[in-house]
């Protein structure tokens, strides 16, 4: 557990022509506030919700009213730090998104109106417990200067706030005021207690009793803002000029790196590590361009068409935002049809289809006959990616689940009597008629209108012949139906199992990519 802290130093028009004179619209006064959003900077295959590490909103700043003809100054800012508590380990790599919002205080219907003025995005590697990191970012014509750090909250310690220091019941080898740090018995740690009165906002300490100042602040308790004109060339949060860092003999003393660059000493000289968008020996050259790679997640950077935007990011699938920093939950659009399970693998969407469906979006219905869809001995007839059931006599409906009266349609001709039977129906024909449906007249001379009867069937016994014929036809049909059903089911199951094994293999490969 710990806290991420963000200190906004200044927000105002950036250098160069075309800088805005006021953050307010023509409708009247406004005030600023900030929103910070933290996202773990893991490989983007790991799906995460927006601001998964947390977010915070600042208080509203003082009301700003544009002075006619006056140049836009550093704008009045809200007081205090923005603090984002985190419960679990500090990830080390993270995306920091800072939004500057404008609250218009003119006569608005329904209360104040809010609009996003600027958004900056920074992907950083930062150890917990380290010193404040300072940065300057441009967002269109605006410039934001800020510092940030991550610190653990006891009993958590370490660069990821994962080690816990707890007092032990056993006697400790550590000196007074120190406690052993689990899991290493011989390691003793004490939370650094800064010098009394050390500024909470502008100072920090790594050793007990010290008070080290955040860049731009000086004095024994870090209460005195450094002069911006003769020293660092940085706009501080106050126009008061009451102090200045005096460069010492070291090449990095006084920090020769402008625009938030960090200085490291080299033999007889220094080297500036510049924040994104600044270059030169002293980070004095500014302006973010496509060559800086401002688009996250592989986004395509295109030079902006208007002077206010130096570039535009064209994002890969699954990402959005001015810098492609926002992950889109593409599964929320429910692209998988027929109840398929959606998997957003980051670089691709995969649909895990329910049995009987296939295709990239589970759009193909395979459940023609594989799912034994026809009940009560009905046979499944395939066609055009769909299926229909040819029902056994006595059953009806889409899946042959509805019991039907086979005699309801009066199927026996010429006054024959209909009897429902387990395999369908049987007609008892009136004298003078024969056939499965009593459709053939028997001539008086004993010769029917049928072709010659097979041996063993006497034309003089039409009812018996009809019943036998019906039973034989029905039995053959049932046996044939069962054979066809078994063969087609085996074929389909083999095909489906093969497809399933292939799909599972592909998905396993994708998830391990």
């Amino acid at each position: 557990a710990g806290v991420f802290e963000l200190q906004i130093h200044s927000f105002g028009p950036g250098p160069g022509p075309g800088a805005p004179r006021s953050p307010c619209s023509a409708r009247g006064p406004c005030r600023l506030f900030f929103r910070v959003c933290l996202k773990p900077g893991l490989s983007e295959e790991a799906a995460e919700s927006p601001c998964a590490l947390g977010a915070a909103l600042s208080a509203r700043g003082p009301v700003y009213t544009e002075q006619p003809e006056a140049p836009a100054p550093d704008l009045p800012l809200p007081n205090g730090l923005l603090q984002v508590p985190f419960r679990d380990a500090w990830p080390g790599t993270f995306s920091l998104i800072i939004e500057t919002w404008r609250e218009e205080l003119g006569d608005q219907i329904g209360g104040p109106a809010w609009s996003l003025l600027a958004r900056v995005t920074r992907r950083r590697r930062l150890a917990a417990g380290g010193p404040w990191a300072r940065d300057i970012q441009r967002a269109g014509a605006w410039e934001l200067r800020f510092s940030y750090r991550a610190r653990c909250e006891l009993p958590a310690v370490g660069t990821a706030c994962t080690r816990l220091c707890r007092p032990r019941s056993a006697p400790s080898r550590c000196g007074p005021g120190l406690r052993p740090c689990a899991p290493l018995e011989d390691e003793c740690e004490a939370p650094p207690v800064c010098r009394a009165g050390c500024s909470l906002e502008h100072g920090f300490c790594e050793q007990p009793g010290e008070c080290r100042c955040l860049e731009g602040w000086t004095g024994p308790l870090c209460m005195v803002p450094v002069s911006t004109s003769s020293c660092l060339g940085l706009r501080g949060p106050s126009s008061t000029t009451t102090g200045c860092l005096v460069p010492g003999p070291g090449p990095c003393d006084g920090n020769p790196c402008a625009n938030g660059g960090s200085c490291s000493e080299t033999p007889g000289s220094f080297e500036c590590t510049c924040p994104r968008g600044f270059y030169g020996l002293r980070c004095e050259v500014s302006g973010v361009t496509c060559a800086d790679g401002p688009c996250f997640n592989g986004g395509l950077c295109v030079g902006g068409a208007d002077p206010d935007s130096a570039y535009i990011c064209h994002c890969p699938p699954g990402f959005q935002g001015s810098n492609c920093e926002k992950r889109v939950d593409r599964c929320s659009l429910q692209p998988c049809r027929n109840g398929g399970l959606c998997l957003d693998l980051g670089h691709a969407l995969r649909c895990r289809c329910r049995a009987g469906f296939a295709g990239p979006r589970c759009e193909h219905d395979l459940d023609d006959c594989a799912g034994r869809a026809c009940a009560n001995g009905g046979t499944c007839v395939e066609g055009g990616g769909a299926h229909r059931c040819s029902c056994a006599l006595g059953f009806g409906g889409r899946n042959c689940r509805e019991r039907a009266d086979p005699c309801a349609a009066r199927p026996c001709a010429h006054g024959g009597r209909c009897y429902a039977h387990f395999s369908g129906l049987v007609c008892a024909c009136a004298p003078g008629y024969m056939g499965a449906r009593c459709e053939f007249p028997v001539h008086p001379d004993g010769v029917s209108a049928l072709p010659a009867a097979p041996p063993g069937l006497r034309p003089g016994d039409p009812q018996r012949a009809g019943v036998i014929a019906v039973i034989v036809v029905v039995v053959i049909a049932i046996v044939a139906g069962i054979v066809v059903l078994v063969i087609s089911r085996k074929k389909r199951m083999a095909k489906y199992e093969k497809a399933e094994i292939k799909e599972m293999g592909e998905m396993h490969r994708e998830l391990n990519a």
Epitope: R125, L300, P316
Partner: antibody
Framework: EVQLVESGGGLVKPGGSLRLSCVAS????????MNWVRQAPGKGLEWVGQ??????????HYAESVKGRFTISREDSKNTVYLQMNSLKTEDTAVYYC????????WGQGTTVTVSS | NIQMTQSPSSLSASVGDRVTITCKAS??????VSWYQQKPGKSPKLLIY???NRYTGVPSRFSGSGSGTDFTLTISSLQPEDFATYYC?????????FGGGTKVEIK
């Protein structure tokens, strides 16, 4: 001006190995995804693999045809991306290009790899 | 993998002609299609991204259109420097895949 310069191509026997390099200039290299794309003689373009950023733990992705044989790495301090090719096959013969980003916006001039006995 | 089928594989045209090249995806790729131009012995250059957006520095005679599965690259008035091979590529689904190319030759 953005420049990507590949090197390391040459003639190698089947089963052999080769390491290609691509040096970038004119861009903040450490902020760019890097890809290798190849083109067999007289054929079309085929994506080979990709390496992402330090903040992505240098995640790599490969085409099925090269998985397990090719390895991509990068050295941000040298503005360089590498393609280590092992167990080479005749069908790996191609011009190999390094490109940036997800949409292959910047391309190098290419280096030729010939796998033949 | 998504297949991209380009047609024609080659065409002959004269300077000033209007040229249309089509690309068909084996499944829906939204508008995540790019077009590249490659001259003999040179590396490909990005012309169009997002199906219809011209990349920085690309002349206005090049335009792209389409969405879903059918895409078109149009050169409104062919110039001598446009004789080259053109490739479409899809970026909707990983891995990215390309069409077989269309060679535009002088008639």
């Amino acid at each position: 001006e953005v420049q990507l310069v590949e090197s390391g191509g040459g003639l190698v026997k089947p089963g052999g190995s080769l390491r290609l390099s691509c040096v970038a200039s004119g861009i903040t290299f450490s902020n760019f995804w890097m890809n290798w794309v190849r083109q067999a003689p007289g054929k079309g373009l085929e994506w080979v693999g990709q390496i992402r950023l330090k903040s992505d733990d240098y995640a790599t992705h490969y085409a099925e045809s090269v998985k397990g044989r090719f390895t991509i790495s990068r050295e941000d301090s040298k503005n360089t991306v590498y393609l280590q090719m092992n167990s080479l096959k005749t069908e790996d013969t191609a011009v190999y290009y390094c490109t940036t980003g997800y949409y292959f916006d910047y391309w190098g001039q290419g280096t030729t790899v010939t796998v033949s006995s | 993998n998504i297949q991209m089928t380009q047609s024609p594989s080659s065409l002959s045209a004269s300077v000033g002609d209007r040229v249309t090249i089509t690309c068909k995806a084996s499944e829906n790729v939204g508008t995540y299609v790019s077009w590249y131009q490659q001259k003999p012995g040179k590396s490909p250059k990005l012309l169009i991204y997002g199906a219809s957006n011209r990349y920085t520095g690309v002349p206005s005679r090049f335009s792209g259109s389409g969405s879903g599965t059918d895409f078109t690259l149009t050169i409104s008035s062919l110039q001598p420097e446009d004789f080259a091979t053109y490739y479409c590529g899809q970026f909707y689904s990983f891995p990215s895949t390309f069409g077989g190319g269309t060679k535009v030759e002088i008639k």
